[in-house]
Interface confidence: medium
């Protein structure tokens, strides 16, 4: 690598993957082994992000960009650039303190991450139950009753509710 | 990159209503919920309520219940917070977030200011 | 109605352990998680579910949770933690609720 030779900053000429080591008169130095450096000018290199435990790795670091991880299966991920790894549970049921629960009553999850959600309410929409809701599936409305031929019947949710202590995530 | 984009700073009169966005990007936006937060000058974080982008269910801290509303558009991945009766204690940056029962991504916040 | 009560104040020199608690009738049942929050800054997550850190935070931050009271640790405390830390929590009908909040001073 040769030495910089702009006037300004010596340091601006060294490109990603490089740093410039004070050390060594601001010679643009390679980044030493898992570490990176994704923009021109460093003067250090970052440390590559290392997926271990429940993390795996996505893509594996290179002198200019960092490693990327994703979760083992069983796992989805959280968080920005998945910084977090957190259990799967199946549909019909919410992930709590004391592990995976079953949906209450008037609840549904359809994905195997996320919290048990509140059935639609039809009748907010002047709408009627066409199909009742179940740990898995929401509602689906039909017409409003009064859309409804005579002697059809409708069936419609009691309020949701949540035992006590059904925690979120 | 997952982002959330907020609307820039407002100055309101006491009464009136303000209407803030947050867009969405770089994730499923039905995926999770929509909360917003607001933190007064020199105070702490204050929960306002959240949106569910599937069917725009939608759930308030009582503090705010009746003068808050958070809406949803799936089409463009943004979420809205409008709040009525404006007073001077309203004054606080409003941050809208990411997640369920806890927030794993904050947008930059927006400044609302409130005076006569 | 879910309340989390912090002390207002903790105050420690560099390289000390500093221990910020939390507590509130509901933790033993549901999830503690903890903000860093520095002046002009969104929150952070340092810590989720009481105890897991997600990546890219450092090491010396963990959670401990025990019967109605949650604590977040900061052990080895730099001039960087300086900063609000804040509990939170939510109750069984997705309420969310912050603590008041514990401005962590570093001597």
């Known amino acids: 690598f040769e030495r910089t030779r702009s006037l300004q900053d010596p340091c601006s000429n060294c490109p990603a993957g490089t740093f410039c080591d004070n050390n060594r008169n601001q010679i643009c130095s390679p980044c030493p082994p898992n570490s990176f450096s994704s923009a021109g000018g460093q003067r250090t290199c970052d440390i590559c992000r290392q997926c271990k435990g429940v993390f795996r790795t996505r893509k594996e670091c290179s002198s200019t960009s960092n490693a990327e991880c994703d979760c083992t299966p069983g796992f989805h991920c959280l968080g920005a650039g998945c910084s977090m790894c957190e259990q799967d549970c199946k549909q019909g049921q919410e992930l709590t303190k004391k592990g995976c629960k079953d949906c209450c009553f008037g609840t549904f999850n359809d994905q195997k991450r996320g919290i048990c959600r509140p059935w639609t309410n039809c009748s907010l929409d002047g709408k009627s139950v066409l199909v009742n809701g179940t740990k898995e599936r929401d509602v689906v409305c039909g017409p409003s009753p009064a859309d409804l031929s005579p002697g059809a019947s409708s069936v419609t949710p009691p309020a949701p509710a949540r035992e006590p202590g059904h925690s979120p995530q | 990159q997952m982002q959330l984009v907020q609307s820039g700073a407002e100055v309101k009169k006491p009464g009136a209503s303000v209407k803030v966005s947050c867009k969405a990007s770089?994730?499923?936006?039905?995926?999770?919920?929509l909360h917003w937060v607001r933190q007064a000058p020199g105070q702490g974080l204050e929960w306002m309520g959240m949106?569910?982008?599937?069917?725009?269910?939608?759930n308030y801290s009582q503090t705010f219940q009746g003068r808050v509303t958070v809406t949803r558009d799936t089409a463009t991945s943004t979420a809205y917070m409008e709040l009525n009766s404006l007073r001077s204690e309203d004054t606080a940056v409003y941050f809208c977030?990411?997640?369920?029962?806890?927030?794993?991504?904050w947008g930059q916040g927006t400044l609302v200011t409130v005076s006569s | 109605l879910l309340v989390l009560t912090q002390s207002p104040s903790v105050s420690v020199s560099p390289g000390q352990t500093a221990r910020i608690t939390c507590s509130g009738d509901?933790?033993?049942?549901?999830?503690a998680y903890w903000y860093q929050q520095k002046p002009g800054q969104a929150p952070v997550l340092v810590i989720y579910?009481?105890?897991e850190r997600p990546s890219g935070i450092p090491e010396r931050f963990s959670g401990s949770s025990s019967g109605t009271t949650v604590t977040l640790t900061i052990s080895g405390v730099q001039a960087a933690d300086e900063a609000d830390y804040y509990c939170?929590?939510?109750?069984?009908?997705?309420?969310?609720?912050f603590g008041g909040g514990t401005q962590l001073t570093v001597l």
């Open positions: 977030a990411r997640g369920f029962g806890f927030i794993d991504h």
């Open positions: 770089g994730y499923t936006f039905t995926n999770y919920y």
């Open positions: 949106v569910n982008p599937i069917g725009g269910y939608t």
């Open positions: 509901a933790l033993p049942k549901q999830y």
């Open positions: 579910k009481d105890s």
């Open positions: 939170q929590s939510a109750d069984s009908s997705d309420i969310v609720v």
